[in-house]
Amino acid sequence: LEETLLNTKLETADLKWVTFPQVDGQWEELSGLDEEQHSVRTYEVCDVQRAPGQAHWLRTGWVPRRGAVHVYATLRFTMLECLSLPRAGRSCKETFTVFYYESDADTATALTPAWMENPYIKVDTVAAEHLTRKRPGAEATGKVNVKTLRLGPLSKAGFYLAFQDQGACMALLSLHLFYKKCAQLTVNLTRFPETVPRELVVPVAGSCVVDAVPAPGPSPSLYCREDGQWAEQPVTGCSCAPGFEAAEGNTKCRACAQGTFKPLSGEGSCQPCPANSHSNTIGSAVCQCRVGYFRARTDPRGAPCTTPPSAPRSVVSRLNGSSLHLEWSAPLESGGREDLTYALRCRECRPGGSCAPCGGDLTFDPGPRDLVEPWVVVRGLRPDFTYTFEVTALNGVSSLATGPVPFEPVNVTTDREVPPAVSDIRVTRSSPSSLSLAWAVPRAPSGAVLDYEVKYHEKGAEGPSSVRFLKTSENRAELRGLKRGASYLVQVRARSEAGYGPFGQEHHSQTQLDESEGWREQLA
């Protein structure tokens, strides 16, 4: 970026620069015509027959440097070829010299500073690349010369530029004084201010654009070079704050629109609000949950909002003496979460009718809460009690919801006490293919024994398919179709109105090897 300090092409009034000495053949201000056919103010000098050692000086007005350390001067000039000038003396030149003088104010006069090198500082002797020449009978031809010089380092408030002619025939068509600065730059959401380079390279600290935050690491900086260019180097830069996304080629942060959000700073764009949430304002870092929906503390800010599940369905109970197997179906509505668990609440009512929360003598397998599978086995039920179980489904947001937790109830009334185990089995007769068994009638606490169930299998054959059952209403039974000379394990249980009692201990019996032995009565 170039900042102009002076451009004679843009001047409409006379320049009225100072010349020295006040003699004929001095620099003269004239109107000229530039390449764009615009009238411009120019200075011309053409004293090619001057006395040796005599110089013509031209000095600009005072130019404030505006913080520039190095200033560039672009000169556009034409120069006549000495060879084309028949009356030119040996002192005819095709060069001129440029100087500058620094001061803190416009203090120069017609005579001061002294018109010489030191106090003036020489910049360069400028030679023409293109000479205007004329040959007899031909047009004069020539081109404009363009030369850019560098002044500095400058330290005072301003300066004058001076031109010294020592015998050239030339015109200064325009003078453009400017300095170079690094233009304001926004890159990676980092703004680097307009910077005038004071040295070869100057480090410049960047600042995050509005609604951006510094990225981790060193604070962003770029180098401004003396030529007004930013040095190419990676910028750690900044990133948009939560609720904002990068826009316009990573030069600004734009607030997330309504209905969108961005939870974290950094790259990435605003996303539509997740399920069951909304953002009614722009610039949302998080979307608010709809009424009745929640996020668990451990849920990411960008997670959908969820709700507690509905009640489990279809609770099925299977009572077996003092044990109860409960099984149910998952709730219709999971609430949108995967972390579904179940819990049970239990109340028990005595035969007399007084009810209370279940006592500690009940055991739940796997447990009364945090169940991940839809079943539980409850043990230790008392006979002739009525139990009410409430099965609830829970998830990670159940604790955030207010109001009652939906549940599915199930009532179970236990039977009166079942008969005790049958243990004193004896073999009354055996043959190669049958066994006759008998046992003592157990004392049933809740009414008479209605019947018995005999369970038997060959010893060593223990799979479910080898087990056989036999029901009998008497306290004896005959097992037929057995293998010759085989050992059998037998258990018996009794049933009353309260249900089956437990199987007794296994009883070991053996069939006869052959028929000749006949029936043999075995007494236990």
Partner: antibody, heavy 126, light 107 residues
Framework: QVQLVQSGAEVKKPGSSVKVSCKAS????????ISWVRQAPGQGLEWMGQ????????DYAQKFQGRVTITADESTSTAYMELSSLRSEDTAVYYC???????????????????WGQGTLVTVSS | DIQMTQSPSSLSASVGDRVTITCRAS??????LNWYQQKPGKAPKLLIY???ILQSGVPSRFSGSGSGTDFTLTISSLQPEDFAVYYC?????????FGQGTKVEIK
């Protein structure tokens, strides 16, 4: 503002010569083109030739080649036009005119003449 | 030398009229063409140079156009002081030439 002041009217015999002067006042002289233009009574303008004093040599219209000489004296900022072998048809007002821009201060060869002398009447009569 | 032909040689017009004068060169002269106005007993006055550049101090009702061989001077609204003779002038080579002139008279 530059002024071009020409010498006075002349009456000449056929076959003779006439030298008309044109003095420029104020500022640069050497690098402007000075043209000579004549106008016979009731006729149009006729370009005769021009000189850029710093270069010394002049350019002439074919019609006047060999009969006209244009010179310049940089020390007095004066240009001259001498026409020889005068004929009656050379009776005319002779103007000197200066170009708008110097040879150094224009990018184009416009040679537009924006300063004119007052004119010098040359009468050729026997 | 390059020949310059102006047309018309004369024209009659009223104040306020739009007037157009043309000038044709015998060969390409790019835009190296000037226009002058001359009133009786006076030296010519430069109006336009470089085919279309208005000389400082000349009213904007005067305009020029063209390049190559065909050129035009236009007076958009003729004023009483514009009645004069107008000349084109080519400066393309070392030998300048004028057109024969166009006289603009009051109708």
């Amino acid at each position: 503002q530059v002024q071009l002041v020409q010498s006075g009217a002349e009456v000449k015999k056929p076959g003779s010569s006439v030298k008309v002067s044109c003095k420029a006042s104020g500022g640069t002289f050497s690098t402007y083109a000075i043209s000579w233009v004549r106008q016979a009574p009731g006729q149009g303008l006729e370009w005769m030739g021009q000189i850029i004093p710093i270069f010394g040599d002049a350019d002439y219209a074919q019609k006047f080649q060999g009969r006209v000489t244009i010179t310049a004296d940089e020390s007095t900022s004066t240009a001259y036009m001498e026409l020889s072998s005068l004929r009656s048809e050379d009776t005319a007002v002779y103007y000197c005119a200066r170009s708008s821009y110097t040879i150094l201060t224009t990018y184009y060869n416009y040679n537009a003449m924006d300063n004119w002398g007052q004119g010098t009447l040359v009468t050729v009569s026997s | 030398d390059i020949q310059m032909t102006q047309s018309p040689s004369s024209l009659s017009a009223s104040v306020g009229d739009r007037v157009t004068i043309t000038c044709r060169a015998s060969q390409n002269i790019n835009n190296f063409l000037n226009w002058y106005q001359q009133k009786p007993g006076k030296a010519p006055k430069l109006l336009i140079y470089g085919s279309s550049i208005l000389q400082s101090g000349v009213p904007s009702r005067f305009s020029g156009s063209g390049s190559g061989t065909d050129f035009t001077l236009t007076i958009s609204s003729l004023q009483p002081e514009d009645f004069a003779v107008y000349y084109c002038h080519q400066v393309s080579d070392t030998s300048d030439t004028f057109g024969q002139g166009t006289k603009v008279e009051i109708k």
